[in-house]
């Protein structure tokens, strides 16, 4: 195994030694420790946790552990002027008000500083008006409302159910539709799995539970006031009017008990089809406004949150590499939570803590990795990936020259059914090989490999006998590393059975009920799934930092590039006449993909045969592998999204959580039949094909023999 050939190696100090040192009981203890009080970004409690982690990582044996602070824009409710929503009668009297807080879970009644549910970065305002129900507030939902049902949301307050897409996209869509306020709610159809009790008796969302979350549309900018640059002591800050990604209309989240009170009175149009109906006992009428008896009643929002520049703290730990200290493998996950963070993020932070401890143990015994490993505890992820982005902005020159890989470590679990991996194609073979060596924790797969249970439960849609690996999207701290800097990235966690559980995320996501007990009682009592995730994340970091030849296979990129080219061509061929009229051809892209495939194949042959004892040639080959991901970066970025620079992947313009392939071409084609100037629109399609074809060809040439 390549990892046996690391420096200062004794038979004891190999991947097995690292993996064997990881203990479920430790992860459990760390999770308990990290979840007893809230750790909201920008608060004293989260600063204290940062210092605790710094101290413990030093004790574990890292070479150095530093705090990196930034002053970024955050958002908080007004403690003396709470946010709520009312139904008002014709006299303006409030006849119903939504709740001001979630009922605290058992054992947490006396905990202070539980932030009430709010939509971070909502502007202040008290709009009142008629309600329109907009389903999930997706692009296609507004198309249905506006184009098919001829319902105008202008000047209305819209109510949307959480799920399917990132909440910031919902708010953006509502703004574009002319809405003057947005109410977000959790429908039991999406956040209450059948046959499971609500917390504290099960893992389902109670009626008073509410999902917090930011509603920004940052598109990778980081701190809204300092896009592109770190929010340091001498930063120039934009005025709030020029800040990136802030919503322009008030937004507030509620639970399904309160949603019932708003939705039961809805009149106007019936829902267009069954996909617009949730599970509440309400008609799911679209509106606008309330039905006959209640037609004079209106909805009023009362939002008083404030945006404040606040100090945040990342913890950065270093384990110096013995042979290539200037090559960085990064393991990072966030520390800040909305409340207790039982799953998000502390189930991930506890795993990182145990991985650091295991690496530290090996280091104390005289071992070092071949390459430098950086460990990060990011702050303010919940407020827009701010900690990771500011640190990467500050260190961008180092990272773009030295960054080998980034492994993300947010929530370790969102279910307990099977593994879920999203990563660059360069890591497919690494993930496959690693999971074949790990034991499955799943019932019914005793003595079988993780690869086997994963493949059985989550098969690849394209390749039989292989597991599904998804594209990276965003909504987590890998974003800046992958989408902006072009550093090979991956993430892994245990997930639910998507076939049988159609709810979005996990039911208690970002609620006060995301506690240690939720995990310990209902998700992973033995912490065996956490341990497996630690083995996957830690094993990936170990191999990336220690193998003599980087464990990247460029041939897998060739395969997906062909798949993505076929897909975007198929989308374009929906418009055969326009393709003909405007002479749109994908020949250049298919030619570039063909060249990439041939060059990648030849590179892989050379990789098998070269003299690994020659450090110059070894470094040269490894640099070609390291810089391949970087070669997909377009310095000009995507149209109107300058910080999304990866030409092959970007977060979907319609759902930040999802990844889109050839996003430049995809967005140019999207809804093209509605564009007022088809010639201009198809010209942009042609330009994007040109950019994509050039980028793929240029990336291919980085794998050619250097002379």
């Amino acid at each position: 195994k390549s990892s046996n050939e690391a420096t200062n190696i004794t038979p004891k100090h190999n991947m097995k030694a690292f993996l064997d040192e990881l203990k479920a009981e430790n992860i459990k203890k760390f999770l308990y420790n990290f979840t007893q009080i809230p750790h909201l970004a920008g608060t004293e409690q989260n600063f204290q946790l940062a210092k605790q982690i710094q101290s413990q990582w030093k004790e574990f044996g890292l070479d150095s552990v530093e705090l990196a602070h930034y002053d970024v824009l955050l958002s908080y409710p007004n403690k003396t002027h709470p946010n709520y929503i009312s139904i008002i009668n014709e006299d303006g009297n409030e006849i119903f008000n939504t709740s001001l807080f979630e009922p605290p879970p058992p054992g947490y009644e006396n905990v202070s500083d539980i932030v009430p549910p709010f939509s971070a970065f909502s502007p202040q305002g008290m709009p009142e008006g008629d309600l329109v129900y907009v389903n999930y507030a997706r692009t296609e939902d507004f198309f249905k409302l506006e184009r098919d049902m001829k319902i105008n949301c202008s000047g209305k307050i819209v109510i949307a159910r959480y799920g399917k897409v990132f909440r910031g996209n919902k708010v953006k869509n509502a703004q574009l539709a002319g809405a003057k306020g947005v109410i977000l709610y959790s429908d039991p159809a999406d956040y209450f799995a059948p046959g499971v009790k609500s917390y504290p008796d099960g893992w389902n969302l109670p009626g008073g539970g509410v999902q917090r979350g930011n509603i920004l549309n940052l598109n990778g900018a980081g701190d809204p006031l300092t896009p592109g640059y770190p929010a340091n002591e001498y930063a120039y800050r934009r005025g709030i009017a020029e800040a990136v990604g802030l919503p322009s209309i008030p937004v507030h989240p509620i639970g399904y008990y309160d949603a019932q009170k708003l939705l039961e009175k809805m009149g106007g149009s019936a829902p267009p089809d069954s996909s617009w109906r949730g599970s509440l006992k309400v008609p799911y009428n679209v509106g606008p406004g309330f039905t006959g008896n209640f037609s004079t009643q209106k909805v009023k929002m009362h939002i008083h949150s404030t945006n404040e520049v606040t100090r945040i703290y990342n913890v950065i730990g270093t384990l110096r590499g013995a042979v290539e200290p200037d090559r960085y493998v990064i393991l990072g996950g966030h520390r800040d939570s909305w409340v207790f963070g039982g799953i998000d993020p502390q189930s991930g932070a506890a795993v990182v803590h145990e991985i650091v401890r295991s690496f530290g143990t090996l280091k104390k015994e005289g071992w070092r990795p071949r390459r430098t490993i950086l460990f990060a505890s990011w702050d303010a992820e919940e407020f827009g990936l701010l900690g990771s982005t500011e640190w990467a902005e500050e260190n961008s020159r180092l990272l773009q020259e030295r960054g080998v890989a980034y492994i993300n470590a947010d929530s370790s679990i969102e279910g307990n059914y099977t593994l879920r991996v999203d990563c660059t194609p360069l890591m497919y073979s690494l993930v496959h090989n690693l999971t074949k060596e790990l034991k499955s924790p799943d019932e019914g797969f005793e003595g079988k490999s993780l690869y086997e249970s994963w493949t059985k439960k989550s098969p690849s849609p394209e390749f039989s006998g292989m597991p599904r690996i998804s594209k990276l999207g965003s909504g987590n701290d890998f974003e800046v590393f992958f989408q902006r800097l072009g550093i090979a990235s991956g993430r892994a966690r245990y997930t639910k059975n998507w076939e049988t559980n159609k709810f979005s995320g996990y039911p208690l996501y970002h609620s006060v009920y995301e506690t240690y007990e939720l995990v310990e009682k209902f998700y992973d009592p033995m912490f065996k799934y956490h341990l497996t995730v630690a083995q996957v994340r830690g094993g990936m970091v170990f191999e990336l930092a220690n193998s003599i030849v980087l464990p990247f296979d460029c041939r897998d990129y060739a395969v997906v590039l062909r798949k993505y080219a076929d897909k975007i061509y198929s989308i374009s061929m929906k418009h055969p006449q326009e393709m003909k009229t405007y002479s749109v051809s994908f020949d250049s892209l298919f030619s570039a993909v063909k060249n990439f495939t041939e060059i990648a194949s030849k590179f892989s042959e050379r990789l098998q045969d070269f003299d690994k004892s020659n450090p110059i040639v070894l470094r040269m080959m490894n640099d070609q592998l390291m810089f391949l991901e970087r070669a997909f970066i377009d310095p000009l970025g995507l149209p109107d999204r300058p910080f999304y620079r990866h030409v092959i992947y970007a977060p979907s313009s319609h759902n930040k959580y999802a990844g889109e392939s050839f996003p430049g071409i995809y967005d140019a084609l999207f809804d093209i039949e509605s564009k007022v100037d088809p010639s201009k629109a198809w010209g942009e399609v042609k330009r994007q094909i040109y950019v994509a074809a050039f980028t793929v060809q240029a990336a291919a040439e980085t794998l050619s023999e250097v002379a």
């Epitope: 061509y569 198929s570 989308i571 061929m573 929906k574 055969p576 006449q577 393709m579 003909k580 039949e673 509605s674």
Partner: antibody
């Protein structure tokens, strides 16, 4: 050679459900729209709706919206037209046709006669 | 969108010409050069005869021709033959993946 082969004639009772098919061969099924066209006895052609098999994007003509469902299975190069509850007035010949550049229906299936009678 | 208007019937003797009109609006026939014509013999599937107003697919005799003026398209069959007796339908693209069919014209060869 491009071919659209439709399933056989159907005789059904009112209220019954029905799914008829159109199997394509000789071309890249996923990258051409398929249309379904109704011809009632002694009447003209009416476009019911179209589907793009690659992503199952479906557009219905207003008078057929909610009355029928058009679908496609790209793994077997087949488009479908279905009813959940047939009426006597659904008695007609149903054609599938491929749509290509120039917005034209260049290849047609042989047609399926559906008879709905109690 | 309403169906395109065609005359219910047209006729001519062998060797003569017959012209069928197809009237729409500026949103369909008048707005796009995407009018096509289909021939349907009894009990058979329609067959494409003309596309993009004037173009003929290979295999279609050159006695079939198409034209357009304003919101009205026309199909002319010159040198009428017995096998040309059939129903003829026009169709026009109407934007945003919408299509409109004509009401149909029965051509009789006297």
């Amino acid at each position: 050679e491009v071919q659209l082969v439709q399933s056989g004639a159907e005789v059904k009772k009112p209220g019954e459900s029905l799914k008829i098919s159109c199997k394509a061969s000789g071309y890249s099924f996923t990258t051409y729209w398929i249309g379904w066209v109704r011809q009632m006895p002694g009447k003209g052609l009416e476009l019911m709706g179209i589907i793009y098999p690659y992503d199952s994007d479906t557009r219905y003509s207003p008078s057929f919206q909610g009355q029928v469902t058009i679908s496609a299975d790209k793994s077997i190069n087949t488009a479908y037209l279905q009813w959940s509850s047939l009426k006597a007035s659904d008695t007609a010949m149903y054609y599938c046709a491929r749509i290509t550049g120039g917005y034209l229906f260049d290849y047609w299936g042989q047609g399926i006669l559906v008879t709905v009678s109690s | 969108q309403s169906a395109l208007t065609q005359p219910p019937s047209a006729s001519g003797s062998p060797g003569q010409s017959v012209t069928i009109s197809c009237t729409g609006t500026s949103s369909d026939v008048g707005g796009y050069n995407y009018v096509s014509w289909y021939q349907q013999h009894p009990g058979k599937a329609p067959k494409l005869m003309i596309y993009e107003v004037t173009k003929r697919p290979s295999g279609v005799p050159d006695r079939f021709s198409g034209s357009k003026s304003g919101n009205t398209a026309s199909l002319t069959v010159s040198g009428l033959q017995a096998e040309d007796e059939a129903d003829y339908y026009c169709t026009s693209y109407a934007g945003s993946n919408k299509y409109v069919f004509g009401t149909g014209t029965k051509v009789t060869v006297l």
